[in-house]
Amino acid sequence: EPPTACREKQYLINSQCCSLCQPGQKLVSDCTEFTETECLPCGESEFLDTWNRETHCHQHKYCDPNLGLRVQQKGTSETDTICTCEEGWHCTSEACESCVLHRSCSPGFGVKQIATGVSDTICEPCPVGFFSNVSSAFEKCHPWTSCETKDLVVQQAGTNKTDVVCGPQDRLR
């Protein structure tokens, strides 16, 4: 790292090291030989999250309900607001600036991982012995019915989209 002229939490201005403003405060005026750096707290709905020399605080993020967003964590003077999505929706990016509806798993696919506010549904194909006959964001693949345990026989084989069809055993005459 290149050498710096000042201590940590200081900045160089007019050949002099001035104190940075602490998180939650903005710079009003630089220090002089006789005066300290002047800082002011950020206003309502504003924040600064680092030691800084910013003359304006940042606005808290707005969680727009029209985009399916809601407040997960209210911002403070030192932290931004954290948005998440309404139930049934998830963020389109890490910054969570908008939401999309959770994906449903088509027939033949089951839910491997249920969606959260920040991640979409993860689907997986139903393996042999399992099926899903609905389009759902919650349903896993279900195992085929075991005809044998019901003292029945398979009359129609199952697929990844349909259950087996059981029927009575043929009686020997």
Partner: antibody
Framework: QVQLVQSGAEVKKPGASVKVSCKAS????????MHWVRQAPGQGLEWMGW????????NYAQKFQGRVTMTRDTSIPTAYMELNRLRSDDTAVYYC???????????????????WGQGTLVTVSS | DIQMTQSPSSVSASVGDRVTITCRAS??????LAWYQQKPGKAPNLLIY???TLQSGVPSRFSGSGSGTDFTLTISSLQPEDFATYYC?????????FGGGTKVEIK
């Protein structure tokens, strides 16, 4: 009372490395920057850099950039200065020195040294 | 880097004399200046900081003045224990820099 106790004298060959330690006692080690200053025989004082024992942050003089490493171990309040690729003109007494705690320092870096180690003589000779 | 120039490089004086050492910075450093005393084989000892503030335990015969680029260390009445080398140091910005030193010798 505040004390800075340094490791003993070292004799090194050109191209080698040396690591000098400085054990602090009598104050909160993480609360004050530690600086390293050297003095060649019969010469003046030369500032090498500082370490903030709290964050581990460092700042080295341009002259020593890439050759010096300052570290600390807060569990045994000790600061270290390692100098690599030693040359004969690195022969000097190396001092650790503590920042004067100036409560009202509002501008300037205000690094004055109120406590010094006893010094460690490093001799570089083939 | 800020250059610190001390003068004289040496001075011969007698006990009881008034001794003045000057230090000039290559650019303005406000009042961010310290003075140290160093005796042979010993670490430096802080005498004055912020140009004129006497460090705790330092005799009042030592005083400092100046701001900007020109600074002075004065020993009002030299004592036997004051024969030593004196250094100024700027504390305005890094890298910290020292003057070349002034050796106060017995006349």
């Amino acid at each position: 009372q505040v004390q800075l106790v340094q490791s003993g004298a070292e004799v090194k060959k050109p191209g080698a490395s040396v690591k000098v330690s400085c054990k602090a006692s009598g104050y909160t080690f993480t609360g004050k920057y530690m600086h390293w200053v050297r003095q060649a025989p019969g010469q003046g004082l030369e500032w090498m850099g500082w370490i903030n024992p709290d964050s581990g942050g460092t700042n080295y003089a341009q002259k020593f950039q890439g050759r010096v490493t300052m570290t600390r171990d807060t569990s045994i309040p000790t600061a270290y200065m390692e100098l690599n690729r030693l040359r004969s003109d690195d022969t000097a007494v190396y001092y650790c020195a503590r920042d004067q705690p100036l409560g009202y320092c509002t501008n300037g870096v205000c690094s004055y040294f109120d406590y010094w180690g006893q010094g460690t003589l490093v001799t570089v000779s083939s | 880097d800020i250059q610190m120039t001390q003068s004289p490089s040496s001075v011969s004086a007698s006990v009881g004399d008034r001794v003045t050492i000057t230090c000039r910075a290559s650019q303005g450093i406000y009042s961010w200046l310290a003075w140290y005393q160093q005796k042979p084989g010993k670490a430096p000892n802080l005498l004055i900081y912020t140009a004129s503030t006497l460090q705790s335990g330092v005799p009042s015969r030592f005083s400092g003045s100046g701001s900007g680029t020109d600074f002075t260390l004065t020993i009002s009445s030299l004592q036997p224990e004051d024969f030593a080398t004196y250094y100024c140091q700027q504390a305005n910005i890094f890298p910290l820099t020292f003057g070349g030193g002034t050796k106060v010798e017995i006349k």
